[in-house]
């Protein structure tokens, strides 16, 4: 398994990840957003709701 060198993003990237943590993938020369639960997108800019349908009376 290849080792990936990571560190925190620089202050230059403040605000890059809207709803998540910014990680600097050193060997890949790029910033990566680790999104909070419920968010997706390159910059964690999209909110998605997982809707759980209640069980129908027939099923009960």
């Amino acid at each position: 398994v290849a080792q990936v060198s990571i560190t925190k993003c620089s202050s230059d990237m403040n605000g890059y990840c809207l709803h998540g943590q910014c990680i600097y993938l050193v060997d890949m020369s790029q910033n990566y957003c680790r999104c909070e639960v419920g968010y997706t997108g390159v910059r964690c800019e999209h909110f998605f709701l997982t809707v759980h349908q209640p069980l129908s009376k027939e099923y009960v």
Epitope: T7, S10, S11, D12, M13, G15, Y16, L18, Y24, V26, S29, Q30, N31, V42, R43, E45
Partner: antibody, heavy 116, light 106 residues
Framework: QDQLVQSGAEVKKPGASVKVSCKAS????????IQWVRQAPGQGLEWMGR????????KYREKFEGRVTITADTSTNTAYMELSSLRSEDTAVYYC?????????WGQGTLVTVSS | DIQMTQSPSSLSASVGDRVTITCKAS??????IAWYQQKPGQAPRLLIQ???TLQPGVPSRFSGSGSGTDYTFTISSLQPEDIATYYC????????FGGGTKVEIK
């Protein structure tokens, strides 16, 4: 293949304004920051400012504050840099640079000549 | 604004020589420094980022080191194709380039 294609060379008179465009292809500018850097003939590289196209937020180098405006049109995947009150010292090659999802990917540069 | 003082501004060395360029930041930049090579009429080419990480395709004779405010870029054995101007860039807090170092062959 990712590309940043800039508008063509411009010749402007002192006091005029110039607007340079930077069209991205192969990626979405909303995923990045777009920086602008210039280089006068025979001189070094100078960072001017940047935009976060997703939120429209800008940061400028102090010396350009009030004279430079960086904008982005996410519908056309294009960033712009407008410099006003041009003087001869603004004669330079202007580069747009993508950062964020990839460290510093440069456009080909746009030569702006300021001459009376 | 963070200032980057790059030295020397120019140097002349022989093929095979070890060449060293330094950049001093006006404050701690936490290793967020990159080094570029620029040849006349071309856009800058990224060689190294995050102090010492070589970009794909960049020869191993190029290296970088440092921490805090003091950083060094080294060409271990100068080649004719290395004739260019080299710039440091801090990207810890916004961005600032060093003044550049023009490398020539003796």
């Amino acid at each position: 293949q990712d590309q940043l294609v800039q508008s063509g060379a411009e010749v402007k008179k002192p006091g005029a304004s110039v607007k340079v465009s930077c069209k991205a292809s192969g990626f979405n500018i909303k995923d990045t920051y777009i920086q602008w850097v210039r280089q006068a003939p025979g001189q070094g590289l100078e960072w001017m400012g940047r935009i976060d196209p997703l939120r429209g937020r800008t940061k400028y180098r102090e010396k350009f504050e009030g004279r430079v405006t960086i904008t982005a049109d996410t519908s056309t995947n294009t960033a712009y840099m407008e410099l006003s009150s041009l003087r001869s010292e603004d004669t330079a090659v202007y580069y747009c640079v993508r950062s964020g999802t990839l460290f510093d990917f440069w456009g080909q540069g746009t030569l702006v000549t300021v001459s009376s | 604004d963070i200032q980057m003082t790059q030295s020397p501004s120019s140097l002349s060395a022989s093929v095979g020589d070890r060449v060293t360029i330094t950049c001093k930041a006006s404050q701690d930049i936490h290793k967020y420094i990159a080094w570029y090579q620029q040849k006349p009429g071309q856009a800058p080419r990224l060689l190294i980022q995050y102090t010492s990480t070589l970009q794909p395709g960049v020869p191993s004779r190029f290296s970088g080191s440092g921490s805090g405010t003091d950083y060094t870029f080294t060409i271990s054995s100068l080649q004719p194709e290395d004739i260019a101007t080299y710039y440091c860039l801090q990207y810890d807090n916004l961005r600032t380039f060093g003044g550049g170092t023009k490398v020539e062959i003796k």
